[in-house]
Interface confidence: low
């Protein structure tokens, strides 16, 4: 039908819209510092480095990890992108000055247990939520 | 006690170390383009602008919104920061080249209903999750 032909043409037009982000991601950085796609990076945090060694008894530190990388189109399945992030990448292509790319953020976080002194020098064992990055995605 | 004094001093030091981020966030940008704190920004997405007007029947577009802004220490309550984000800001202060700041991402997303033609020109009404940003936070 005419309407399905129009839709097909429309899709063919939009065909060429979205890979542009890979270019803009390249131009966002000097070639020497091109970012890879959004992913989890390993990071060990030492409580001593944070200056907390005198009130955190254990552990001495933990594998916190962090998220970093590009959220450029196409947002492949492993990027755990939300529907909104997919739409935002398209809007960014057309208005890169106005709307940023989605950002690479934790999608799964785990807790850790910490043994520490409270303000009254009591020893407390407490579970702290959302301390360890398990997975990252584009949001 | 001596240990509690040490802990107090340690906390004072870490307090001072954390406000530094306000300065570092300022120095990350030219004064003409200083970023505000992480927050929700309004954004209307027109499906025509995305080239989808011939296969999305309704709505013509929607208020998608987006998140943008700085996640610098101190991460105030309204920034909806996770424990991990708070730790990451401290690590970033000490290793800005190595670990990025947390990023400003949606914390609450809503669905919208979309009426569209599928590939066989059937009219489909479907609710799509995670399409509208309701709130943002540092992650």
């Amino acid at each position: 039908s005419a309407s399905s032909r129009r839709r097909q043409q429309s899709r063919n037009r939009s065909t060429q819209s979205q890979d542009v982000a890979r270019v803009s991601s390249a131009s966002d950085y000097n070639s020497s510092e091109l970012k890879t796609a959004c992913r989890k990076h390993e990071l060990y945090v030492s409580f001593q480095d944070l200056g907390w060694q005198d009130w955190i008894i254990a552990p001495k530190g933990y594998a916190a990890n962090y998220c970093d990388g590009e959220c450029s189109f196409p947002l492949n399945a492993h990027m755990n992108a939300t529907n909104h992030a997919i739409v935002q990448t398209l809007v960014h292509l057309m208005n890169p000055e106005y709307v940023p790319k989605p950002c690479c953020a934790p999608t799964k976080l785990n807790a850790i247990s910490v043994l520490y002194f409270d303000d009254n020098s009591n020893v407390i064992l407490k579970k702290y939520r959302n301390m360890v990055v398990r997975a990252c995605g584009c949001h | 006690s001596a240990s509690s004094r040490r802990r107090q001093q340690s906390r004072n030091r870490s307090t001072q170390s954390q406000d530094v981020a306000r300065v570092s966030s300022a120095s990350d940008y030219n004064s003409s383009e200083l970023k505000t704190a992480c927050r929700k920004h309004e954004l209307y997405v027109s499906f025509q602008d995305l080239g989808w007007q011939d296969w999305i029947i309704a709505p013509k577009g929607y208020a998608a919104n987006y998140c943008d802004g700085e996640c610098s220490f101190p991460l105030n309550a309204h920034m909806n920061a996770t424990n991990h984000a708070i730790v990451q800001t401290l690590v970033h202060l000490m290793n800005p080249e190595y670990v990025p700041k947390p990023c400003c991402a949606p914390t609450k997303l809503n669905a919208i209903s979309v009426l569209y033609f599928d590939d066989n020109s059937n009219v489909i009404l479907k609710k799509y999750r995670n399409m509208v940003v309701r709130a943002c936070g540092c992650h």
């Epitope: 839709r7 060429q16 979205q18 890979d19 542009v20 196409p74 | 479907k126 799509y128």
Partner: nanobody, 124 residues
């Protein structure tokens, strides 16, 4: 499925020109984005150029002013006109297409399709 076939590669002297073509077939109605990538020996694949739904274009900094991307919807073909070629442009050039469909599963972005590549060699 989408099939992509590139052509137009070859050997050229520095300063010369080539025109690459990419013919798309199959479920082309589902394609939403197309671009040209290249991969030099020992290097990562990089995007060279792409074209938006309105026909606006974007280029990698290294090819701006020298390369031009275009398309012919009637022929379902994507082109890359490469002028003032340099030895550092030597690479295998790939055509890519990306699909994003409104499906029952969501706003799908999962498929990107690739051609087999065409070799471009620029000698000094």
């Amino acid at each position: 499925e989408v099939q992509l076939v590139e052509s137009g590669g070859g050997f050229v002297q520095a300063g010369g020109s080539l025109r690459l073509s990419c013919a798309a077939s199959g479920s082309i109605f589902s394609i939403n984005a197309m671009g040209w990538y290249r991969q030099a020996p020992g290097k990562q694949r990089e995007l060279v150029a792409a074209i938006t739904s309105g026909g606006s274009t974007n280029y990698a900094d290294s090819v701006k002013g020298r390369f031009t991307i275009s398309r012919d919807n009637a022929k379902n073909t994507l082109y890359l006109q490469m002028n003032s070629l340099k030895p550092e442009d030597t690479a295998v050039y790939y055509c890519s297409a990306v699909t994003i469909l409104l499906t029952s599963g969501g706003w799908g972005s999962g498929n990107d399709y690739w051609g087999q590549g065409t070799q471009v060699t620029v000698s000094s």
